[in-house]
């Protein structure tokens, strides 16, 4: 069977006026996954995002991440889009320096 990922969005200060938002998916199986940032509902181009490899996390499941740099104050226009085993979920950027875990249920 399939195991849905845990998805976690964090933010960190980049250069002045910019922040890096990172979306991590973990504990999922099988390894096929789509993880991408969307702006105003539409996927960002590949060249504006950085992806990590899909790696085993030691429990027979996998993990990966995607990050992009955005202007501070524009965070609410962005969502991390996750697609796995025919299911999808969207994950906004938290306010301030907090972070939040979302569990996507199949």
């Amino acid at each position: 069977g399939s195991v849905p990922p845990m998805v976690n969005v964090t933010r960190s200060e980049a250069s002045e006026g910019n922040i890096t938002v990172t979306c991590r998916a973990s504990s999922f199986y099988p390894r096929n996954i789509t993880l991408t940032w969307r702006q105003d509902g539409v996927s960002l181009s590949h060249d504006t995002q950085q992806w990590g490899d899909v790696l085993p996390d030691g429990n027979g499941t996998y993990q990966t991440w995607v990050a992009t740099r955005i202007c501070q104050g524009e965070e609410q226009r962005f969502t991390c889009y996750m697609e796995h085993s025919g299911n999808h979920s969207t994950h906004p950027v938290p306010s301030g320096n907090s972070h939040h875990h979302h569990h996507h249920h199949h």
């Epitope: 509902g41 539409v42 609410q76 962005f78 969207t90 906004p92």
Partner: antibody, heavy 117, light 107 residues
């Protein structure tokens, strides 16, 4: 102009199924998620689920995941909601809406589904 | 699931009145809140998103504010066309949930 045009009213018997359509125009259909919401008579709004028309991937409210099926036809720019095992409590207006990042910017006109024996 | 508690459920007001509607979330929704206006037999119309951003074409008498769990929609000077039902909706996490609505009636 972005438009979502839904199919007409339906009357169904308990236990039957209904399929509501939502035809999109004025934008790139496969680029945006389509959401489904319902509103029982005189009641509030309830989110049913969403579909990515580009890939067919879905996200269901747990309450509906056993009875609702969301599909999309890219060739006709049309999204569909099928609800099975209908009961009287499913009598409601069903809406589709476009997900623009983190809100719904455009809604269909609604489709009234009446479940009555 | 995040519960959205909207108040009041209804109110009576006169043209020109200032009207305030509140929405409280059962958890922090990080300002991912929208307000909609709905008239009988019509679909909801987006008024405000991201808690305080006015949607295109919405008159400036409408404003939204709030953060964390508490949010407010204000109509600074009620106009005849504003008599309707207003809903809030959170977009922080699925299932997306709505307030039960506030019906604004003519006094």
């Amino acid at each position: 102009e972005v438009q979502l045009v839904q199919s007409g009213a339906e009357v169904k018997k308990p236990g039957a199924s209904v399929k509501v359509s939502c035809k999109a125009s004025g934008y790139a259909f496969t680029n945006y998620l389509i959401e489904w919401v319902r509103q029982a008579p005189g009641q509030g709004l309830e989110w049913i689920g969403a579909i990515n028309p580009g890939s067919g991937a879905t996200n269901y409210n747990e309450k509906f995941k056993d009875r609702a099926t969301l599909t999309a036809d890219k060739s006709t720019n049309t999204a569909y909601l099928e609800l099975s095992s209908l009961r009287s409590e499913d009598t409601a207006v069903y809406f589709c809406a476009r997900f623009l990042g983190n809100y719904f910017d455009n809604w269909g006109q609604g489709t009234l589904v009446t479940v009555s024996s | 699931d995040i519960q959205m508690t909207q108040s009041p459920s209804s109110l009576s007001a006169s043209v020109g009145d200032r009207v305030t509607i509140t929405c409280r979330a059962s958890g922090n929704i990080h300002s991912y809140l929208a307000w909609y206006q709905q008239k009988p037999g019509k679909s909801p119309k987006l008024l405000v998103y991201y808690a305080e951003t006015l949607a295109d074409g919405v008159p400036s008498r409408f404003s939204g504010s709030g953060s964390g769990t508490d949010y407010t929609l204000t109509i600074s000077s009620l106009q005849p066309e504003d008599f309707a039902t207003y809903f809030c909706q959170q977009f922080w996490t699925t299932p997306y949930t709505f307030g039960q609505g506030t019906k604004v009636e003519i006094k």
